[in-house]
Interface confidence: medium
Amino acid sequence: LRPSRVHNSEENTMRALTLKDILNGTFSYKTFFPNWISGQEYLHQSADNNIVLYNIETGQSYTILSNRTMKSVNASNYGLSPDRQFVYLESDYSKLWRYSYTATYYIYDLSNGEFVRGNELPRPIQYLCWSPVGSKLAYVYQNNIYLKQRPGDPPFQITFNGRENKIFNGIPDWVYEEEMLPTKYALWWSPNGKFLAYAEFNDKDIPVIAYSYYGDEQYPRTINIPYPKAGAKNPVVRIFIIDTTYPAYVGPQEVPVPAMIASSDYYFSWLTWVTDERVCLQWLKRVQNVSVLSICDFREDWQTWDCPKTQEHIEESRTGWAGGFFVSRPVFSYDAISYYKIFSDKDGYKHIHYIKDTVENAIQITSGKWEAINIFRVTQDSLFYSSNEFEEYPGRRNIYRISIGSYPPSKKCVTCHLRKERCQYYTASFSDYAKYYALVCYGPGIPISTLHDGRTDQEIKILEENKELENALKNIQLPKEEIKKLEVDEITLWYKMILPPQFDRSKKYPLLIQVYGGPCSQSVRSVFAVNWISYLASKEGMVIALVDGRGTAFQGDKLLYAVYRKLGVYEVEDQITAVRKFIEMGFIDEKRIAIWGWSYGGYVSSLALASGTGLFKCGIAVAPVSSWEYYASVYTERFMGLPTKDDNLEHYKNSTVMARAEYFRNVDYLLIHGTADDNVHFQNSAQIAKALVNAQVDFQAMWYSDQNHGLSGLSTNHLYTHMTHFLKQCFSLSD
């Protein structure tokens, strides 16, 4: 089902998209991810907000928690205990950073239909979760971790040194949350809940970013965040494990850091429980080209954790950084020592490998000039993963099953031919033992979610097919989309072009380049979207193009690592190269070309505008990075090394937007930033503006008071309206 191909015989009933459609979210779609609670059961929140339990095998469903109970505490989320005796209800959601938030939690006893009274949870809580078995609770309050054996019991305090902005227990600090884990939590139950592992982050020596939050008080508040910029002091991390059955007996035991990692600054990257008495930790040197996976065992005699050198596996990159965006996580097999993991093969493509003893002896499971993207599940006889192998389109995702019980292993594409026109980009969600799974298709047609049998792959039912959206789009003139590639100097540049509904190759159209371009990103994807650029093509007659150049992901290490230690060079060159190729196609008005981007895309759009090529008439940068010295250490150093004389300071200095201030003289530039951006600090745009003023270069700017990196709420409407006016003016389009 491709909405762009929906034709209505009554052409006059068809209308173009409006900006209002986009801002109101008129054409948004739904997905259905089952909240699995067993091999054959899942929970789902119904349209009327009841929490319903579905049993696939019996076909029965019943409400386990009524909307009345939810409403009684204004709950916006819930969590069922594994023993099904209790539900936590989450309310008073208060967002902090990208993933973190605080909330108030109430525990509802399903056996008597009442809220648990006595020893209530403190508020607000930073993180709360059930144990994987039974109904133990672990939670983080004021940066300390607490444990309850049962919801009504008094809590046992595990840590005592937690302090705001200084010591974080069980939750990450800003940089670990955004750039390393990336989660709101930093604690992990062992499979049966015997042990609880947690991270402690010490931010005492980290420099603090401070910015004003204006609010509506007489004096603005100052927000302080320990935020390590490139080259600055980093958080010090330690990992502890406590026996939750007898937490006071030995107390938390620290897991040792591998010697080769501990010899200099390092990061903890993830923790994976293998069994109740075996845990796997991943560590990374600050210079992020060496990662160590360490498998540790519980020693009963000492009540401590032993991480022998023989169980340390090193992953090293000689051409770039370790991993893709993150170092991949292991998926352990049933023997509890061997595992599957995605890393680069000898040809420089990310593939699944099976590691039994050493990384050197790893058995390669997938291979080819494409990449394995994610391992979803390993069972006794199958491994499910996603890749972009099918028909050699890097922007697609299909789900595959490899039989690992038989030799040689056989491979089957589960999704390739299911709804080929409609669905070329999938993810999956598996029940226990992969008895059943849900497929969620994101496009290129209207998204659809379906339920499947884990043994036969047979479709059982449609969970969500977005019928209302399909009907609503019947009288909309959607733009046409095409995904193609350019071959330039041994580099393949994939692009997506969004064309006006009545596109005519013999006419000339204004061109807008939308760019992100960050390392290990991908913009050219076969997904459905009705968004701002859809409107610009549908109503305003623009051609919009997205190009994946050097530094982008899932096409091999040669393309990915091309930008290593040289951010801001090839990403920009490749956008410019693509624009020249688009002009050669004959339907682009070369006097009306613009570029825009957000975040990393704002950095690239700024550099492209200041490239001195004369290609761009105008452009927009939203919340751009302007110097890599201003951005987070973990992200920046992964790709750029350190801003020191003996490392890469020279390129840090050469790659700033400010250094090119003079070159903005002949373009129309719109610079936009939120003043409360905790991620890409307002400082970045402030420095661009200062450099432009000092160079006496005219430009336009818009700030959004008290808005963060997402520019959400009413700011979103204002932002897109403002950018629309700017582009229409640039392209001489009537309002």
């Epitope: 330690r238 502890f240 030995v250 107390g251 897991v255 010697a259 005699d301 050198k309």
Partner: antibody, heavy 120, light 109 residues
């Protein structure tokens, strides 16, 4: 800077008692297991006792089991060794040592020691 | 109980020479759990090597550790005047919690 300062040593008669203290500074005391190690005059090093960071777990060498008690006060950043039923063979310099972590690993910092002499 | 035996008892060498100290365990010790310490007269011991081969912070690279199983070695590539001292190996991997070797004295020839 990590510092460990032992005190409480001295001359005591066989069968007597003594309490050693070790004042710690320069690190988060409660996050580390601690030990006592002794060295008899002209002899080698002998581990005596260890305690976990929380104080919930204690261990002793066979030679002192039942006579010595290790403890800690995390609010005061202080480690203790209560020595009862002292014998002549307990005569030694007693060192307080910090382990590398809460778990039972090598000693990365040592105090200067306090001399205990058991003699009649 | 694991017993650590160090040899030789005394090693007489001149500055600039190479020193090789041996530590043998009565049963296998995880290399993750073997350390070496240096002690000078009237001073507390100082950590040199942990995990059999990892140098502690601030230890010069002329000190190196190696070995696995039951045989471990501490090597001082070129003796400096300040290196003349007693060296102890220690295991911290099984009950009893810690065991030290009896020590090797490195003195000036």
């Amino acid at each position: 800077e990590v510092q460990l300062l032992e005190s409480g040593g001295g001359l005591v008669q066989p069968g007597g008692s003594l309490r050693l203290s070790c004042a710690a500074s320069g690190f988060t005391f409660s996050s580390y297991a601690m030990s006592w190690v002794r060295q008899a005059p002209g002899k080698g090093l002998e581990w005596v006792s260890a305690i976990s960071g929380s104080g919930g777990s204690t261990y002793y060498a066979d030679s002192v089991k039942g006579r010595f008690t290790i403890s800690r006060d995390n609010s005061k950043n202080t480690l203790y060794l209560q020595m009862n039923s002292l014998r002549a063979e307990d005569t030694a310099v007693y060192y307080c040592a910090k382990t590398h972590s809460t778990s039972w690993y090598y000693f990365d910092y040592w105090g200067r020691g306090t001399l205990v002499t058991v003699s009649s | 109980e694991i017993v650590l035996t160090q040899s030789p008892g005394t090693l007489s060498l001149s500055p600039g020479e190479r020193a090789t100290l041996s530590c043998r365990a009565s049963q296998s010790v995880s290399s993750s759990y073997l350390a070496w310490y240096q002690q000078k007269p009237g001073q507390a011991p100082r950590l040199l090597i942990y995990g059999a081969s990892s140098r502690a912070t601030g230890i010069p690279d002329r000190f190196s550790g190696s070995g696995s199983g039951t045989d471990f070695t501490l090597t001082i590539s070129r003796l400096e005047p300040e290196d003349f001292a007693v060296y102890y190996c220690q295991q911290y991997g099984s009950s009893p919690r810690y065991t030290f070797g009896q020590g090797t004295k490195v003195d000036i020839k």
